[in-house]
Structures are given as C-alpha cells and as structure tokens.
Interface confidence: low
C-alpha cells in the first residue's frame, strides 16, 4: 500500500511532498557550514557544533532535541612530543625522520587544532628494529610470509600499505605475527587514480597526505572501558589493561613520500608476486631489514600519544508518530571528523540536516508520520563507533522492543559514478521500489529512473535486470543496531566505478585535504548526487515510518539464506574426507532454510489479504515483520565476539568493513586444515551448523500463524 494511505495524511503530505522539499542548494550550504573548522571528537569545537545542530533541529520543527553525553576513552597525540619514525644508523643517530604534519591545503594555513596524522589508540613506545614489508597486512599476506616464504616477523617492525581491509585488522594480524611496531602508509597504487591531479588541483592524494584512523579491534564493544554498558556518570570502568580491543604495539601512519624513503632501502626477499608491488619506484622487497650498504641501519618509531577518558555528545531529535509513537525509525550519522570532514562525515551530516528540515516543514503544516522518527548526530564514530554504541547500550531495552529500522547516514559520496546500497534483505524491495520512483542524476540517463542507471552501472551478480545490493559489514554506526540488537538496517551513498578505480575508498580519505572545496570542485559541483542520496535515505525513512504495513519482504531473506547455505556448504566440501570422518552434515541447515522459505511464502500470502482496518491484526503482522530481524540474534553472540550476535551476518573476522554470511560456520571452517586438533575443530564446525540451523528454524517460526 502506498504511504499516503497512512492515518492523518492529506494528499499533499505524501512522499512526493517530502522529496520535493529537499534542495541541493541547502545541502551545499549546510556542508560549507559544517566544514570550516575541524570537529574532532572530544573537542570544544565539536561540542559547539552539537549545540548548533540541536538548536537548528528545534527550529526545523522537531518535537524535542536532546544532547546525550558519555565519557569514553579517546586517543590524542601529545602536543609537545610529536610522533614520528626515523631511520637510525649504527650509532643510533637519526638520519631520516618522517614529517610531523601534512602541509595544509590552500586557504587553511592559519586554521588551528588540525590534529597531526596518528593512529588512534596506539600505545606509547619507541621500538627499533628491522623492517618487514607485509603488503596489505591481510591474513593471507601473513600466511604467504610465514608459511610460504618462511619469514618471521617476530621482533620486527612491519610496514603495510593501507587498503583492502580495515586498518585494525592489519594491526591485529601484525601483533599475532609477533611484530613490535606497525607503520601504515598510502601507496599510490591504492590512493592515486591514474590521470587525475593531486589536491588542490584534483582529487588525488599528494605525497605528504596521510590517512588517520583508529586501530582498535573492538568487535562491537563500544567504549573500550565499559563494554556492554553505557559510559555514563556512574559507570564502572575497566582499567586500561583490561580495556577491550586496544592494540599492544605502537602504530603510526605516513604518506607515500615518507614511505618511499623507508621502502627504497629494503633488502631480503623479493616480493612473492606482482600483487605485492605498489606504484612507488622501489623494489618492494619484503626484508627483513635494509639491503647491502644500509644493512646496519634500523627503523625507530617514536610514539607518545595518550588515551584519555573524554566527554562526547550525541544529538538526538524526535518527531513523534501519530499512530504508533512506540515504534521507532532511526536516521543516524556521525558529526565528528578527523579534520575538516569534507566527505567523511559532513557530506552525510548535511544530508541528514536537510532531511530533518523537510520533515520539519511537513510537521509545521500539520502532518505527522505514522511511527516515531528519531534523528541522531553521533559523536566519536571515528574512535570506534562510540557515540552510537553507547546510546544504543543505554537505550537497548527500548530499541529491542520498539526499533523498526535504522538508516545510516555517514558520507553521502565516495565517488560520483553510481548508487551503492548495503542493507538487510528485508529492505531489498523497499530500495528497488523507491529507486524506480526517483530520477537518475547520472549523465546519459536524463529522464531515466535511478533504478535504471544503478542497475546498468552496478548489476547484481546473481539476478539479471537488478542492481547489486551488498551485505552489511561494519565500520560505521549501524553496527550496534544491526549486529548487536538485530534491528533491520540499511545504508546508501554514491560511489565510484569499482571496475576502473581499484583504489581503496577515496584517495583523500581521513586526510587534511578532505575539505568543502574537494566536494564542491571535484566530486559534486551541482550537489545533485548529494540530493539523490538525500532522496534515497529520506525516502526510505519516510516509507518505513509511514506505510501502513511495514515495507519488509521476508521472502527476500529466504532467497539469500539459501544462497548463503549453498556458499558455506561448498566451502566445507573442500574437505570431503574430514566431513565424512567427523560426520559433518548440513542437512539441518538446509532443512531449516527450506522451512523458512515455505513459512515466509505463506506469511506473504497472509500479508496480502488480512484486514488492515483491524488495528490489532495490523499491529500483529507488523510486529512479526519488525521482530524477524531480531529473531536472527543469538543472545550468546559469536565465539569470542559477544557483541556480534547476528547469526546470518557479521563483520568478517579478517576485515571489519566486509560482511560475512553464516559467520560462525565460516570462522570455524577458516584455515581448518592447519588446526592442531582436527577433531575439536570439526566439532566446532558441527556446533556452528547446529546454532545456524536452530536460529533459521526459530526465525521461521516467528512468521508462522500465531494461533
């Protein structure tokens, strides 16, 4: 049923009225306003921005706007004792030092409080030793080094290039390999697109540009000192030694000019293959240590950053629902940035601001959504998704009972090629239907729908004539809502052409050069892509909050469950002998998926023809839809990852950014051939199949007729 059938809606106040109110010019103006100074989490500047947003959301017409503060562990460089890396000679003299800051972009030379590049939460330390180049520091890179090349990283400082996987996974892998320090750098192969100039003349990374970022392995814990509970006034805090997810070895990021100086002297083993070579004019030797004449020189890190409990502020705005005020649809994105935040996060925050303004305009004209909409400006996302996680921990009982959906709103763009959507399968049909109603902003698709340009440029690998929609992983503020609480979630942004631009993220990500001008000059001068993203995010929120029957299709979950079961079975079948020896069977899982498919199909039939005028029956059916995502939550969580509780999806154990399906089974099977005790390892596979099969069956039963 269409949105404008909802109670208290005049024909004027339908989805079209909401979308028509969204203006590209406003998004541009808001982006400019949010990017003139740094808004680092825990700083006075970011507190002032929180209060400004609170004030403006009130003016826009929300019913209430509150600040929610928490005292969480953050990390900052020491202002009087800068971090850097040296090459030292045999006498211990520093013969080369990396730069202490990025050269500021034009027009920003006099801006104060630009935090120098650092790896947030690095411990202090001054390790020195031989260098080992570890490619991207992925699990498979260390397998290559240790198993194939017999290179031991123990006691070495490793240098890894950014890209492919979350930096925290790189650090964890280096720690497990015994390294005593990690240097992260941006290689032009990953952060310099051919044929494009460096900033300020283009959107590429200059040699002095550096990617900041946290290096935690929180696995969904939130504040490292208060896992599972909000970091409020009466919180019990762990000691720093017991804190969750902190790295144990010093880590520091550098740009490719400085990396060149370290890598050009590398000796030892040659790179194993071309996939280990970047684009610098260096041999990409693995090491350990420097070559020939330089063999007595070592690398020394000087890291003096400190971890400090600091106050952060979320802004939470409420637009009360007219019919179901106890059902929450949440739109949230973060406000804190590493420096100016031109793309991350303010291109997203500006879109949220305009969405709030449009909803507020409708509300001032007498309209209300059917369900309550919550708007959130999260703090400290860059330090480990802390603001969103602490708020969700504080409100978990309300959220698990009342949370309908969460739509994430970080960076609106990471390119200007086509749409990118990651979401729960429950939202596939919502996204498809919405994008068919929106105009494409793409050149060559004038007068065509967004669905058409998106499908053409990013086709689904499985279903012809449909666009690609990816699994949710992590690395953003939806994590606690989806992976921990089981609230249906989605995210949308404009992205690059992954076929032709194989660099990781966008080149200026988390650097000082991520400015308003970067967006206005090079990515989206007309702000038409921002407007399209506002329409997608806002349109999803509108439908979720306003449609009489929730716009979730449980049959799409059935389809992906079968696909994921097939995939994990095929992985297991790489070990047919062991499956036979240890009596490993996937029958229970396939049976549960079959049952889910049948029950979902029957539920969908009932959904077509029940009496929507009966509020009790309507609420009952909607609750079955709302709680379906919740049914995939295992209260015990995944092994060693208690805050990742979704049985169907979790962030990959090897890359936080990526989603993995049936993660419990996947992790149990991973590298199983090298396990010392195969009986125990295959026993764990069987246990994980059991958990997955039970969960799918239990979820199916929530869709059965209630009596």
């Amino acid at each position: 049923k269409s949105s404008n059938e909802a109670t208290n809606i005049t024909p004027k106040h339908n989805m079209k009225a909401f979308l028509d109110e969204l203006k590209a010019e406003n998004i541009k103006k808001f982006l400019y306003n949010f990017t003139q100074i740094p808004h680092l989490a825990g700083t006075e500047q970011n507190f002032q921005l929180a209060k400004q947003i609170q004030s403006q959301w009130k003016e826009f017409g929300l019913d209430s706007v509150e600040l929610a503060h928490y005292d969480v562990l953050l990390s900052y460089p020491n202002k009087t004792h800068p971090n850097y890396i040296s090459i030292i000679n045999e006498d211990g003299n520093e013969i080369f030092n990396t730069s202490l800051f990025e050269p500021p972009p034009p027009g920003y030379e006099n801006v104060s409080d630009i935090v120098p590049p650092f790896s947030a939460f690095s411990p202090q330390g001054m390790p020195e030793g031989d260098l080992v180049y570890v490619n991207y520091a992925r699990t498979e890179d260390f397998f290559k080094l240790e198993r194939d090349m017999k290179i031991n990283c123990s006691g070495k400082i490793v240098i890894a290039r950014y890209g492919k996987v979350f930096r925290g996974n790189k650090v964890k892998n280096a720690q497990l390999a015994g390294a005593k320090g990690v240097i992260l750098y941006s290689d032009p192969a990953d952060y310099f697109a051919p044929g494009v100039k460096s900033y300020p003349d283009g959107w590429n990374l200059p040699g002095g540009g550096v990617q900041r970022g946290n290096i935690l392995n929180l696995n969904g814990a939130g504040d490292p000192l208060t896992p599972g509970y909000p970091a409020n006034e009466y919180a019990y805090r762990r000691g720093i030694a017991e804190a969750v997810g902190l790295p144990s070895i010093p880590v520091h990021p550098i740009g490719y000019y400085d990396a060149q100086k370290l890598l050009e002297k590398m000796g030892g083993s040659a790179p194993p293959d071309s996939s280990w070579r970047g684009s610098l004019k260096v041999p990409y030797n693995v090491g350990p240590g420097f070559t020939g004449n330089f063999s007595t020189q070592k690398v020394k890190m000087h890291i003096h950053s400190t971890n400090e409990v600091t106050r952060i502020y979320n802004v939470i705005g409420t637009l009360r629902g007219a019919v179901e005020p106890d059902r929450y649809v949440i739109l949230g994105g973060h406000r804190d940035s590493w420096v100016f935040g031109g793309i991350d996060p303010q291109s997203g925050a500006a879109v949220v601001h305009e969405i709030v303004r449009s909803f507020g305009t409708l509300k001032k004209e007498g309209w209300r959504p059917r369900r309550t909409i919550l708007f959130a400006s999260w703090d400290a996302e860059e330090f480990g998704l802390l603001g969103s996680t602490e708020w969700a921990e504080e409100n978990s009982r309300l959220l698990q009972e009342r949370g309908v959906a969460y739509i994430n709103a970080d960076s609106s763009i990471e390119g200007n090629y086509t749409l990118r959507v990651d979401c729960t399968p429950l939202m596939y049909s919502l996204v498809h239907n919405l994008t068919k109603e929106l105009k494409s902003p793409d050149e060559g698709f004038e007068g065509k729908s967004l669905y058409e340009s998106w499908t053409k440029k990013s086709p689904s690998p499985e279903f012809s004539g449909m666009p690609r929609i990816s699994k949710l992983g992590s690395g953003n503020d939806f994590e606690v809502f989806f992976q921990r609480l089981g609230i249906a979630s989605g995210r949308a942004r404009y992205t690059k052409n992954w076929e032709t631009n194989k660099f990781s993220g966008y080149p200026l990500y988390h650097s000082v050069y991520e400015t308003y001008e970067l967006v206005e000059k090079f990515y989206d001068p007309m702000f038409k892509y921002h407007l399209t993203v506002a329409q997608v995010r806002g349109g999803m929120v509108f439908e979720l909050a306003n449609s009489i029957v929730l716009p979730f299709d449980c049959r799409d979950y059935a389809v992906v469950l079968r696909k994921y079961a097939d995939k994990i079975y095929s992985i297991s079948m790489k070990h047919p002998q062991e499956m036979k020896t240890y009596s490993v069977s996937f029958d229970s899982l396939f049976s549960a998926v079959k049952n889910f498919t049948e029950i979902a199909s029957k539920f969908s039939e009932r959904l077509q023809d029940f009496d929507k005028s009966n509020p009790i029956v309507l609420r009952m059916m909607n609750d079955q839809l709302m709680f379906l995502e919740r049914a995939f939550i295992d209260p015990l969580g995944l092994p060693d990852r208690p805050f990742y509780r979704h049985v169907i999806y979790a962030p990959s154990s090897h890359n936080k950014y990526a989603g993995e399906s049936f993660p419990g089974i996947y992790d149990a099977l991973f590298d199983i051939e090298s396990k010392v005790d195969p009986s125990k390892a295959w026993g764990e596979v069987k246990r994980q199949i059991y958990v997955a099969a039970f969960t799918v069956q239990a979820a199916a039963e929530t869709l059965s007729e209630v009596a």
Epitope: Y236, R238, D640, K680, G683, E684
Partner: antibody, heavy 120, light 107 residues
Framework: EVQLLESGGGLVQPGGSLRLSCAAS????????MHWVRQAPGKGLEWVAT????????YYADSVKGRFTISRDNSKNTLYLQMNSLRAEDTAVYYC?????????????WGQGTLVTVSS | DIQMTQSPSSLSASVGDRVTITCRAS??????LNWYQQKPGKAPKLLIY???NLASGVPSRFSGSGSGTDFTLTISSLQPEDFATYYC?????????FGQGTKVEIK
C-alpha cells in the same frame, strides 16, 4: 565430561618463577573463558586471573598484576600461568577453572589443584 | 573492589535440617553470583550459577535466590554428604571476589 589437570607446582624460593599448566579434556573449550583461583593453606578462595576464549583479553587480581601472566594455547587445549617474582604470600593451592559456554555458567569446571610453596 | 560477606561463618545442623546461608555484596551485582561447595582436601565444586541455576549433577535440594546485593543458598533437607564449606562468588565486575566461606558442621 570436562576434566582439568593442573601441573607445574612445587617449591620455589622467594623471587623465583614457576609456570603452571592446566590441560583440558572432554567438551569444547573453544568459546570458554578460563581462570586461575588460589587457596592459601587453611584460608578461603582468591581469584587470580581470567583469560578470554580467544586469549585476546586477560584480567588479573591486584595482588598479582605485573608479576603473573595468564595465557592459553587453544590448539593444545592448555591454560598457563607464568608466575614471576614469587613471594611467600603466593603460597597456595592453585586451581584452574573453565566456564561452560553452553549454559553460560562461569567457573563451572575446576581442576584438582597444584600446590605452590614459596619458601627459603 | 566488591566485598562479599557470608553469614554465618559456621553453623551446626543435623541431617534433615533446612539450612540457609546468606551472602551480601557491597554493591549491586545483578544476578552474577555463584555458590560452591568444598570438602577438605578437594577442589571446590560449582553448585549454583547465576544466582539460581542448578549446575549439572547437583541435587535439587540445593537452591539459590536473590538479586542485587542479597543472596541466599538453601539446602532444603541436609544430607550427610552436604557437610562442607560453602562459598559465594560474584563475577559481575573484576576482581571476581569470593565470600569468606560458611562451614556446615554436624551438630
């Protein structure tokens, strides 16, 4: 049935070191936290240290922090306690314990204990 | 640190008696409390976990109750094999502290 078998106890001089081991058999320990608890002669129980299932996180009583290190080797199903700078007040029977992940019970299974005597 | 105070420190009872041991925490520990039984020269044995859940193989005459700061272990009908020392322990916040013990002796 889960069985825990401690070893490595004995007589050691003050300032010396010992490494205790605890071998687990029966059931899966993949997802279980493990612990050391000690009991001085004629006294009550005192928690010493805890380690997470993957070994990523460890926790210590203030009385042993900086001197003792808990670790585990999941491939060998073995828990360890490295005890350095031993003092007379560390004299005790040391028990290793394991949680029961399936039921959520902490300190569900206990070993029979190994005696550590610190004396000159 | 959270202090756990057991009472009484010792008690004398006869076979068939109903015995109650209490344990008080110095701050709220929700339901994160275990009870153990220890016989001389033996390792402690888990009786009750998470305040009221009977551990595997423990007879049903043992029961636990409470929440927050005040907890009780009850033996509904004391048996000869129940004469031992009983400990409570909180595992809400590290350090995971034990009570000082309650010795149940034959009257």
């Amino acid at each position: 049935e889960v069985q825990l078998l401690e070893s490595g106890g004995g007589l050691v001089q003050p300032g010396g070191s010992l490494r205790l081991s605890c071998a687990a058999s029966g059931g899966y320990s993949f997802s279980d936290y493990m612990h050391w608890v000690r009991q001085a002669p004629g006294k009550g129980l005192e928690w010493v240290a805890t380690i997470s299932s993957g070994g990523s996180y460890s926790y210590y009583a203030d009385s042993v922090k900086g001197r003792f290190t808990i670790s585990r080797d999941n491939s060998k199903n073995t828990l360890y306690l490295q005890m350095n700078s031993l003092r007379a007040e560390d004299t005790a029977v040391y028990y290793c314990e394991k949680d029961n992940y399936a039921t959520g019970a902490w300190f569900a299974y206990w070993g029979q204990g190994t005696l550590v005597t610190v004396s000159s | 640190d959270i202090q756990m105070t057991q009472s009484p420190s010792s008690l004398s009872a006869s076979v068939g008696d109903r015995v109650t041991i209490t344990c008080r925490a110095s701050q709220d520990i929700r339901n994160y409390l275990n009870w153990y039984q220890q016989k001389p020269g033996k390792a402690p044995k888990l009786l009750i976990y998470y305040t009221s859940n009977l551990a595997s193989g423990v007879p049903s005459r043992f029961s636990g109750s409470g929440s927050g700061t005040d907890f009780t272990l009850t033996i509904s009908s004391l048996q000869p094999e129940d004469f031992a020392t009983y400990y409570c322990q909180q595992y809400w916040i590290g350090p995971f502290t034990f009570g000082q013990g309650t010795k149940v002796e034959i009257k």
